[in-house]
Amino acid sequence: FERTRSLQDPCSNCPAGTFCDNNRNQICSPCPPNSFSSAGGQRTCDICRQCKGVFRTRKECSSTSNAECDCTPGFHCLGAGCSMCEQDCKQGQELTKKGCKDCCFGTFNDQKRGICRPWTNCSLDGKSVLVNGTKERDVVCGPSPADLSPGASSVTPPAPAREPGHSPQ
C-alpha cells in the first residue's frame, strides 16, 4: 500500500523536517529557518512559535518540532499552549483582582499559583489532626482517637498530605 500511495503521490515520501516543493518538481526540500514539519508528506512547513516579551523559550524550534514557551521568572503559564503569563504569588497566598492575598484561616496554598483550598477535614475520615494546618500546608491527619486507646495493637501511620491540585494550563 505504501508503495502504491507513493507512486500516486510523490509527496508522501517527504519525511518530517521537509516539505514537498511544488516549485521544484515536488522534490522534498528542507524546512526553511524558523519553520518545521512534524509529520511526513507536508506541502508546507509551519512557522515556529516565537517566545518573546513576557514569554521565554523552554524548547527551541527544530525542523521537526515547534518551539515551546514558558514565562519569565515571577510568572507562570495560563491558557492553551501558554498563551498568557500570570504573576506568581508566595506559598500561603492566592492571586485576587487586587493582587496577592494571604490565605484565610482554614485554607492553604502550597504553590505559587492557584487558589487557597480548605484544610482536609480529618474527622470525615474518622481521623484526628496530627499536625495543624498553616497557610502554606494542609493539616496532617493521624490515627483516629479510638486507635490511640490503651491496648491498641498498632498505630496507623500518618496519611500523606493531599496531592497539590494544579490549575489548568
Epitope: 508546507t44 516565537q50 518573546k52 516579551g53 495560563l78 492553551a80 499552549g81 498568557m84
Partner: antibody, heavy 124, light 107 residues
Framework: QITLKESGPTLVKPTQTLTLTCTFS??????????VNWIRQPPGEALEWLAL???????YYSPSLKSRLTITKDTSKNQVVLTMTNMDPVDTATYYC????????????????WGQGTLVTVSS | DIQMTQSPSSLSASVGDRVTITCRAS??????LNWYQQKPGKAPKLLIY???SLQSGVPSRFSGSGSGTDFTLTISSLQPEDFATYYC?????????FGQGTKVEIK
C-alpha cells in the same frame, strides 16, 4: 493608568526620513516583559505592524520594511523613537504606538493600550 | 508571514442582533489570537486576548472562541456603540499580522 502619545511631523517629502516619538506614562520600559510597538494604518485600510522594542533592548522589525526602520528607547525620558528612511507617498498613514506586556497581574503579546495616533502625509 | 483572513468584510445589522465575525489563520496559531475594535478617527481598543479572554472593562456581550486556525468574535446583542470595525491579530510569531477588518454597519 497607561497612556501613550505619538508626535512628529505631519508632512514629509518623498525620500526624506521620518522620525516619530512615542511618549508614555504609567509604565516603565525597564520592567521585565514590557515592550512598545509601532503600528500604522493607511487611510481606509487595515493595520500593519512595523516594529517593537522590549525592556531588554531586544528589537523586532517587519521583514518587508526592516531595511528602512530603526527603533530605539530612552528609558529615562519614557520615550521610544521610530525612524523610517526613504519615505514614499504609499507610507502615508496614521502611525500608532502601543504598549505590550504586563497589565495588572497578566501578561502576553497583545497591544493594549494604544496611543491616539498621528497622521503622516508623504507628498512633495 | 502568517496570513489572517476575516469574514465577512462588512455586515449590516440592527440593534439587538447577534453578530458573528470569523477569522482564519493560514496555519495553526494555537490560542494566540486577539480581537480589537476601532471606531472612525480613533485608535483600536483591545476586546479579547488569547482567543477567549475578555479584556477588563469590555462588556460581557463580547465573546471570543476558537483555537488552531479558526476563530470567532461574537456580539450577543448588538448595541448602538458597537458599530465599528473589528480586527483579529495573531501574536503567535513575528511579524504579528492583522486581518483586513470587518465593518459592522447599521441596517
Amino acid at each position: 493608568q497607561i497612556t501613550l502619545k505619538e508626535s512628529g511631523p505631519t508632512l514629509v517629502k518623498p525620500t526624506q526620513t521620518l522620525t516619530l516619538t512615542c511618549t508614555f506614562s504609567g509604565f516603565s520600559l525597564s520592567t521585565t516583559g514590557v515592550g512598545v510597538n509601532w503600528i500604522r494604518q493607511p487611510p481606509g485600510e487595515a493595520l500593519e505592524w512595523l516594529a517593537l522594542i522590549y525592556w531588554n533592548d531586544d528589537t523586532y522589525y517587519s521583514p518587508s520594511l526592516k531595511s528602512r526602520l530603526t527603533i530605539t528607547k530612552d528609558t529615562s525620558k519614557n520615550q521610544v523613537v521610530l525612524t523610517m528612511t526613504n519615505m514614499d507617498p504609499v507610507d502615508t498613514a496614521t502611525y500608532y504606538c502601543a504598549h505590550e506586556g504586563i497589565i495588572g497581574f497578566l501578561g502576553g503579546n497583545w497591544f493594549d493600550p494604544w496611543g491616539q495616533g498621528t497622521l503622516v502625509t508623504v507628498s512633495s | 508571514d502568517i496570513q489572517m483572513t476575516q469574514s465577512p468584510s462588512s455586515l449590516s445589522a440592527s440593534v439587538g442582533d447577534r453578530v458573528t465575525i470569523t477569522c482564519r489563520a493560514s496555519q495553526s496559531i494555537s490560542s494566540y489570537l486577539n480581537w480589537y475594535q476601532q471606531k472612525p478617527g480613533k485608535a483600536p481598543k483591545l476586546l479579547i486576548y488569547a482567543a477567549s479572554s475578555l479584556q477588563s472593562g469590555v462588556p460581557s456581550r463580547f465573546s471570543g472562541s476558537g483555537s488552531g486556525t479558526d476563530f470567532t468574535l461574537t456580539i450577543s446583542s448588538l448595541q448602538p456603540e458597537d458599530f465599528a470595525t473589528y480586527y483579529c491579530q495573531q501574536s503567535y510569531s513575528t511579524p504579528p499580522t492583522f486581518g483586513q477588518g470587518t465593518k459592522v454597519e447599521i441596517k
